[in-house]
């Protein structure tokens, strides 16, 4: 039986049940390399409290549909008096990066995971030439996730004192230049994740090979190597390579530019101080507030919730968007869709789509940007579920009693972008981390 998601086959993936201190290792095409789980385990559970290992999914006992992968075992379990077998169930949804398997819940018999990934899309529009896992768990099982830094189009410029060259990088995947008609970036070879431009020539100096690694609690490392044979004439016989070290800052700060810290014979060392390198709980919340010792900030957007059936309205030329954030009030146009953002076609108001649901909410504050994300909306033709990204700006003089109003700024591949100036986005910092 052919592997259902070949792009995900090259790696052993990890997921964590934080509540129970359990680490899962997942290999969807073969078996994980953990002796304690046996030779054919596809999903291996490591209980860190009891220091025990169990296989909860066997690679031989795999069944697959387009959106669901199940691994059974021969181990019996008792579920409400009936004799079942322990199994793992992975639900796949279309995403814009390779993504990460997320632990959802576990019963006595079934371990449930969800995975938003390019591998599950109906069309190839989000697929990279080359992409590697872009997250890692530290020794305390805290997740560090650089997926938000991955550029689907374009690149980051590395700060370098050399005026004659420009070094461009992407994070965990190759640089897509197809949407840029005229810049230097267009000359970069396909597949490169680190592109060096000298004059009118562009060179591949690194492609992703291995996933993100953690070297210390707040330092993550990504390594790119040039796969192609044949040395570059300016590298003195060496093969080019790029090492990017992502550093979680010691306190809250604005984002910084990736900086070249060393360069020798086409070996480039880059340091990037970014809060995305910090553990995810430091940056994100499933509610509309971020506060407490863990986050170093106090943010509360809950006053933006609308009551009594009213919604914020944002004009998107062809569409009207109705938004009701930080609550669970149904938007009238999007009745029974559980939408936080509802898209209505002006020319035909019967065409209504959920552009993100209120129970699929993430508030993120990282590198000085405050963003509220709603995902899991109605599917587009690619299979990607519509989502909305609201970028907040602090404005102490915002209208509407300080609440302000969301402004639609554009759409890319079924992701809808808004900006929102409001006094409730003014962040209060506590200075310790």
């Amino acid at each position: 039986q052919a592997a259902p998601f070949p792009e995900l086959c090259s790696y052993t993936w990890e997921a964590v049940d934080t509540k129970n201190n359990v680490l899962y290792k997942i290999n969807i095409c073969g078996s994980v390399d953990i002796v304690q789980c046996g030779p054919s385990s596809a999903v291996c559970e490591h209980d860190l409290k009891t220091r025990t290992y169990h296989s909860v999914g066997d690679s031989v006992l795999r069944s697959a549909t387009r959106s669901l992968l199940e691994f059974n075992t021969t181990v019996s379990c008792d579920q409400q008096g009936t004799n079942h077998r322990v199994q793992s169930s992975i639900a796949f949804l279309c995403g814009k990066t390779l993504g990460t398997p997320e632990f959802v819940t576990a019963t006595e018999c079934v371990h449930y995971f969800e995975w938003r990934t390019t591998a599950a899309c109906k069309k190839d529009i989000f697929k990279a030439n080359k992409e590697v896992p872009c997250y890692v768990f530290d020794e305390e099982l805290r997740k560090h996730d650089l997926n938000p830094l991955i550029k689907l189009s374009g690149a980051y410029l590395v700060d370098d004192s050399d005026p004659d060259t420009s070094l461009f990088i992407n994070v965990c995947r190759d640089i897509d230049t197809l949407r840029d008609p005229g810049s230097q970036l267009r000359a970069c070879p396909p597949g490169t994740a680190a592109c060096l431009v000298r004059g009118h020539q562009a060179f591949d100096v690194g492609q992703p090979r291995d996933g993100l690694k953690v070297v210390r609690k707040d330092r993550l490392v990504l390594s790119y190597v040039r796969e192609e044979a044949g040395k570059l004439d300016f590298c003195d016989g060496h093969s080019p390579a790029v090492t990017i070290t992502f550093v979680c800052p010691s306190e809250r700060r604005e984002g910084t530019i990736p900086k070249l810290t060393a360069k020798s014979n086409c070996r480039y060392e880059i340091e990037w101080i970014t809060e995305y390198a910090c553990h995810r709980d430091y940056l994100e919340s499933k509610t509309c507030s971020l506060s407490g010792e863990q986050q170093d900030v106090s943010i509360d957007l809950t006053p933006l919730a609308q009551s009594g059936g009213s919604s914020y309205i944002s004009d998107g030329k062809e569409y009207l968007f109705y938004l009701n954030v930080c609550g669970e009030t149904e938007i009238q146009f999007c009745n029974k869709k559980q939408a936080a953002v509802c898209q209505v076609k002006k020319s035909d108001t019967s065409q209504v789509k959920a552009a993100g649901r209120y129970h699929n909410q993430t508030l993120r504050y990282s590198d000085g940007d405050l963003t509220l994300i709603y995902f899991g909306g109605d599917e587009c033709s690619s299979g990607f579920q519509r989502m909305s990204v609201i970028n907040f700006e602090c404005n102490k003089t915002a209208g509407n009693d300080g609440k302000g109003t969301p402004v639609f700024t554009g759409e890319v591949d079924c992701t809808y972008f808004f900006t929102w100036d409001t006094e409730y986005a003014c962040v209060h910092h506590h200075h310790h981390h």
Partner: nanobody
Framework: DVQLVESGGGLVQPGGSLRLSCAAS????????WGWFRQAPGKEREFVAA????????SYADSVKGRFTISRDNAKNTIYLQMNSLRPEDTAVYYC????????????????WGQGTLVTVSS
């Protein structure tokens, strides 16, 4: 691709003000950086200011810091350059540009350009 059209240039006295506008059309969200550049006669094109579309993060050339302000109106897909305390050395053709490269001020990293609008500062 992104199409950019500048307006608002003209003749102004030293110490005066002007506001340039740049209207963007096309798939504007595929570009992350919006910049203003200028080119004086016989000189290289130089960076003036930049802003990211998805947030209000800005950067400025040292020569215009404190005098010029870049801003955007997302509802109108328009980028502005408010120029105060203008000096004769600010005389140039001002260009609006868009880039898919983050953190850059280098004109060669900007792939889409407007036609430019002339600003003359003279008494």
């Amino acid at each position: 691709d992104v199409q950019l059209v500048e307006s608002g240039g003209g003749l102004v006295q030293p110490g005066g003000s002007l506001r340039l506008s740049c209207a963007a059309s096309g798939r504007t969200f595929n570009t992350y950086n919006w910049g203003w550049f200028r080119q004086a006669p016989g000189k290289e094109r130089e960076f003036v200011a930049a802003i990211r579309w998805s947030s209000s993060k800005t950067s400025y050339a040292d020569s215009v810091k404190g005098r010029f302000t870049i801003s955007r109106d997302n509802a109108k897909n328009t980028i502005y350059l408010q120029m105060n305390s203008l000096r004769p050395e600010d005389t140039a053709v001002y260009y609006c540009a868009a880039s898919i490269v983050d953190f850059t001020t280098n004109p060669s990293h900007f792939g889409s350009w407007g036609q430019g609008t002339l600003v003359t500062v003279s008494s």
